[in-house]
């Protein structure tokens, strides 16, 4: 491994996963590494591979148990270290004292569906997956629309400020096909960010009413 | 804001000990790796030792391995470092210093560091 410029960022997604992406310029693409865990309060301890996601950076998730279980609390904290092999012998690239609860990003909001479409609204819902039940109703959303010949970036961004697991998109044109993006945030935690945007889901506007004013 | 103060600093002889002390406040003390940095006179920064925010992983330089000892007393808001068997090559000026995040890098242990102290001075002479 070389000592190019290094970061290590692991996230928890509240339940029972954690995710570290590990970039080090200049390292090799066969490069040996792993990402240790050692928790403070708990009887095991995990390792995983980093395995290669782009030319210098590298990805893998600590599984602690079954995906709805709550692994981790707000006290708990995970000793992580990256150690990459060197010869014979692995060598400590990073450390961290991870405080899950302070570094959290959900999972993306699943099972959006259209409730009710008009010529000019749309009701949609969603659900939130493997979120734990510590953060009671304090978690926040962001969603977008996509409409014809628009970009992802150029779509605006709605914010619900509280555990709201639908949406009214108003002011829509008529007989047109959108597409609809939402993601998800707790309240919690001082380097806690957003979840990837969930799955896109399509829906058409209905056509307006023939000889009727719209 | 930031602030980093140093204390414990002051001219002892070698072989005595000294121990400092950097009071932080204006952010989660407990979420950021801290460093110990100095600076001999005429000389660049030289990185002494590191700790994790809950102070699970430590990390010193060759120069002071068995001497110095880092420590971390969240509560207080306060990093420590017991300087023990001083040498004159001790003497610097030591300065506490707050990684940008949570995370520190052992092969490069300068990198990082976002805010430094204004330091204390120690001198080792007989």
């Known amino acids: 491994a070389v000592n190019g410029t290094s970061q290590f960022t692991c996230f928890y997604n509240s339940r029972a996963n954690i995710s570290c992406v590990w970039s080090q310029d200049g390292a090799l693409q066969d490069t040996s590494c792993q990402v240790h865990a050692w928790p403070d309060r708990r009887r095991w301890n995990q390792t995983c591979e980093l395995l290669p996601v782009s030319q210098a950076s590298w990805a893998c998730n600590l599984i602690l148990g079954a995906p709805d279980s709550q692994k981790l609390t707000t006290v708990d904290i995970v000793t992580l270290r990256v150690l990459c092999r060197e010869g014979v012998r692995w060598r400590v690239m990073a450390i961290q004292d991870f405080k899950p609860f302070e570094n959290l990003r959900l999972m993306a909001p699943i099972s959006l569906q259209v409730v009710h479409v008009e010529t000019h609204r749309c009701n949609i819902s969603w659900e939130i997956s493997q979120a734990s039940h510590y953060f009671e109703r304090h978690l926040e959303f962001e969603a977008r629309t996509l409409s014809p010949g628009h970009t992802w970036e150029e779509a605006p961004l709605l914010t619900l400020k509280q555990k709201q697991e639908w949406i009214c998109l108003e002011t829509l044109t008529p007989d047109t096909q959108y597409e609809f993006q939402v993601r998800v945030k707790p309240l919690q935690g001082e380097f806690t960010t957003w979840s990837p945007w969930s799955q896109p889901l399509a829906f058409r506007t209905k056509p307006a009413a023939l000889g009727k004013d719209t | 804001q930031v602030q980093l103060v140093e204390s414990g600093g002051g001219l002892v002889q070698p072989g005595e000990s000294l121990g400092l002390s950097c009071a932080a406040s204006?952010?989660?003390?407990?979420?950021?790796?801290m460093s110990w940095v100095r600076q001999a006179p005429g000389k660049g920064l030289e990185w002494v030792s590191s700790?994790?925010?809950?102070?699970?992983?430590?990390d010193y330089a060759d120069s002071v391995k068995g001497r110095f000892t880092i420590s971390r007393d969240n509560a207080k808001n306060t990093l420590y470092l017991q300087m023990n068997s001083l040498k004159p090559e001790d003497t610097a000026v030591y300065y506490c210093?707050?990684?940008?995040?949570?995370?520190?890098?052992?092969?490069?242990?300068?990198?990082?560091?976002?805010?430094r102290g204004q330091g204390t001075q120690v001198t080792v002479s007989s």
């Open positions: 700790i994790t925010g809950a102070g699970r992983g430590t």
């Open positions: 204006g952010f989660t003390f407990s979420n950021y790796a």
């Open positions: 210093a707050k990684y940008s995040s949570g995370t520190y890098y052992p092969p490069t242990p300068v990198r990082g560091t976002d805010y």
